[in-house]
């Protein structure tokens, strides 16, 4: 601990100029004071001044008022510093002396004489308020006040708590009257050395080195460090922990960049056709009657469905068709007959039955023949039952579908994808072809599976014309041009006419 006992001398009265021994001072009592401060004693005894002692220069003659003086000799209040815990009790001896010698250092002069002395014993708490007192004896009177205050940076009831305000990385605080720390705004902790981070900053994933800051630990982002960072390159995915890539619905692959729902995301099938997903970036369009093409984008001839009956021939018109009926038939589809059974209209052994009192007839056809007049051999392939370009074959009373490579099922409706196992390396695109999967490689790679890194990019020189797409790694020349509609040739350099219209089948 550390503090100061302060004694303020205010007035000394010795009207008759007398010494303690009854003698008078000549020409007057030139007065100085000796102060002795020690531990509390019930009966004051001589001995060392355990808490300190101090002397004054000559302050006046006989009776005088003592003025406050802050520096130099004759300082008032008198200061008695101590370097221990203030015990709260004390004994104080104040002696008034007469000196015939030096004003400034009377203590050293011979022949000094005691004028009077007072002794105070009691308790005194640390504080700023002065305790005022007055002591009289038969000859003299002394007015004074005293207090105990803590030295700079010492606090508490006994001046035992050391506290030094600071604002550096070992603490940001000021000192309370009791010596406890009062943190500066934005700081916390026993020593006020911990910054208070931005409100809401995640406790585990964020930290700060100064107040109102939020620095994210690796794998986290956002103002409050509460958003995880997904795997680098994650395209259509999210994370719940750092470096994760959990795919959004319809996406797959390590980086969620493989479209598992191409149909929904891109709607590639036209003219009301049905789209079916088949693996990453794979889909099949099932066309409505009257449409064909990979995306059902090509309209078939209106006559393709053979609407004319009884051997009528079909002619395409702008938005419909027209049936040219053979002799003996009429109606939009040549469905009405002017013939009767008498005209023997039933072919291939069909039996004729009269209807409407003989004004019309109906043919009952033998097996494998059909038509109003049994004129058609039954073709179970006319309804185009084979999907995905499958070939229909009549086999007696039944028919079978011969499927293209990559398809299976009774109607070739099931897709077998060689690409399902992702055989193409380095981001190559897979295509199901008759002889197995073929990879189209990105620039800089070639080989059947894009496994060969090539130093020379054959597509770099732009060898394909008319907006064709260039691919490397599919041929000995190291590039292949994929021609846009209407162009042919190894570099798509030749324009061609539109393909012939779908042939009409009687």
């Amino acid at each position: 601990g550390s503090g100061i006992f302060q004694l303020r001398l205010q007035e000394f009265v010795n009207q008759r100029g007398m010494l303690a021994n009854g003698q008078s001072c000549e020409p007057g009592c030139r007065t100085f004071f000796r102060i002795c401060l020690k531990h509390f004693q019930a009966t004051f005894s001589e001995g060392p001044c355990t808490f300190g002692n101090v002397s004054t220069p000559v302050l006046g003659t006989n009776s005088f008022v003592v003025r406050d003086k802050n520096s130099g000799s004759g300082r008032n209040p008198l200061q008695l510093p101590f370097n221990f815990t203030w015990p709260g009790t004390f004994s104080l001896n104040i002696q008034a002396w007469h000196t015939p010698g030096d004003d400034l250092r009377p203590e050293t002069s011979p022949g000094n004489s005691l004028i009077s002395q007072i002794i105070i014993q009691g308790s005194l708490a640390v504080g700023k308020i002065w305790r005022t007192d007055e002591q009289n004896d038969t000859l003299t009177r002394l007015s004074y006040s005293y207090r105990v205050i803590c030295s700079d940076n010492y606090y508490g009831e006994s001046c035992s708590r050391l506290c030094k305000k600071r604002d550096d990385h070992f603490g940001h605080y000021e000192c309370q009257p009791d010596g406890s720390l009062s943190c500066l705004p934005g700081w916390t902790g026993k020593y006020c050395d911990q910054p208070i981070c931005l409100s809401g900053c995640h406790e585990q994933n964020g930290y700060c080195s100064k107040p109102d800051e939020c620095i994210c630990r690796p794998g986290w982002q956002g103002r409050l460090c509460n958003e995880c960072i997904p795997h680098n390159g994650c395209r259509h995915g999210t994370c719940s922990i750092p470096w994760q890539c959990a795919c959004d619905e319809g996406w797959g692959g390590l980086f969620c960049d493989q479209d598992l729902n191409y149909c929904t995301h891109h709607s590639p099938c036209k003219n009301g056709s049905t789209c079916s997903n088949s693996g990453p970036k794979g889909y099949t369009c099932t066309c409505l009657p009257g449409y064909t093409g990979e995306h059902c984008e090509l309209g078939l001839s209106k006559c393709a469905s053979n609407p004319c009956r009884n051997g009528g021939s079909c002619k395409d018109q702008e938005n419909s068709y027209h049936c040219l009926c053979p002799p003996g038939y009429y109606g939009q589809h040549c469905e009405h007959s002017t013939l009767t059974c008498a005209d023997s209209p039933c072919f291939n052994g069909g039996s004729c039955r009269e209807r409407n009192q003989g004004s019309s007839y109906a043919c009952e056809c033998p097996p494998n023949f059909t038509g109003s007049n049994c004129e058609k051999k039954v073709d179970r392939c006319t309804s185009n039952p084979c999907a995905n370009g499958g070939q229909c074959q009549n086999r007696g009373p039944s028919r079978t579908c011969r499927c293209r490579p990559g398809f299976t099922g009774t109607h070739c409706e099931l897709h077998i994808s060689d690409c399902a196992r992702s055989p193409c390396a380095h981001g190559g695109t897979c295509h199901d072809l008759e002889n197995g999967p073929v990879c189209t490689c990105p620039a800089g790679f070639s080989g059947r599976r894009c496994e060969v890194r090539i130093t020379h990019d054959a597509c770099a020189s732009g060898p394909c014309f008319n907006g064709a797409t260039c691919y490397t790694g599919l041929s000995p020349n190291n590039f292949v041009c994929n021609c846009p509609y209407g162009f042919v040739g190894s570099r798509c350099e030749f324009p061609v006419g539109l393909p012939p219209s779908f042939p009409w089948v009687a």
Epitope: R166, D168, F170, G171, D193, S209
Partner: antibody
């Protein structure tokens, strides 16, 4: 008991970067009560504080060396590091790493044994 | 730049004698002073922190004080093992500052 151990090359050419590692054992570098400092002592001279670091990565440098000094920390390895760039002959010194204690008001209660780094071509 | 100046630079003392080393700096009393003992070819050792406190294991003959512009290290009754160089240290804002050192030699 906490121990600190400096390691790194003993000879560095002028103009190059001096790199030292301090490995802490017997205690965690991630404690909130400590800063981890570097101090050097040129032959026959006094101590010079270089800088210190908190486990979160907050750094404080001596203004006279600030432009050339980088201190970093790896809590997973319980190590902190000193890099001093563009070294010159007067950077020849024994380099100490030390623990600065908040409770001791910044006093350094544990020191490494020091490593001598000589700057010479 | 904050400067700490120690005095004396060198002191030759007989055993059992009292040693006083002073460290001066502007308003040093408002900062916490630490003292380090360094023997030849050894690392510094903390002997006083927070002006006057001794770490465990440091003999009671070592004491410290700090007020005004001066911090003081006192070795009350010097022993042969106390021969060393003593450094004062304080923090000025966020920078550590050392005194130039005082070498204490046994006569």
């Amino acid at each position: 008991e906490v121990q600190l151990q400096e390691s790194g090359p003993g000879l560095v050419k002028p103009g190059e970067t001096l790199s030292l590692t301090c490995t802490v054992s017997g205690g965690s570098i991630s404690s909130s009560s400590y800063y981890w400092g570097w101090i050097r002592q040129a032959p026959g001279k006094g101590l010079e504080w270089i800088g210190d670091i908190y486990y979160t990565g907050s750094t404080y440098y001596n203004p006279s060396l600030k432009s050339r000094v980088t201190i970093s920390v790896d809590t997973s390895k319980n190590q902190f590091y000193l890099k001093l760039s563009s070294v010159r002959a007067e950077d020849t010194a024994v380099y100490y790493c030390a623990r600065e204690d908040v409770i001791l008001r910044g006093g350094s209660d544990y020191w490494g044994q020091g490593t001598l780094v000589t700057v010479s071509s | 730049e904050y400067v700490l100046t120690q005095s004396p630079d060198f002191q030759s003392v007989t055993p059992k004698e009292k040693v006083t080393i002073t460290c001066s700096g502007q308003r040093l009393g408002d900062k916490y002073a630490s003292w380090y003992q360094q023997k030849p070819d050894q690392s510094p050792k903390l002997v006083i922190y927070e002006d006057s406190k001794r770490p465990s294991g440091v003999p009671s003959r070592f004491s410290g004080s700090n007020s005004g512009d001066d911090a003081t290290l006192t070795i009350n009754s010097l022993e042969a093992e106390d021969a060393a160089t003593y450094y004062c240290q304080a923090w000025d804002r966020d920078t550590g500052v050392f005194g130039q050192g005082t070498k204490v030699e046994i006569k």
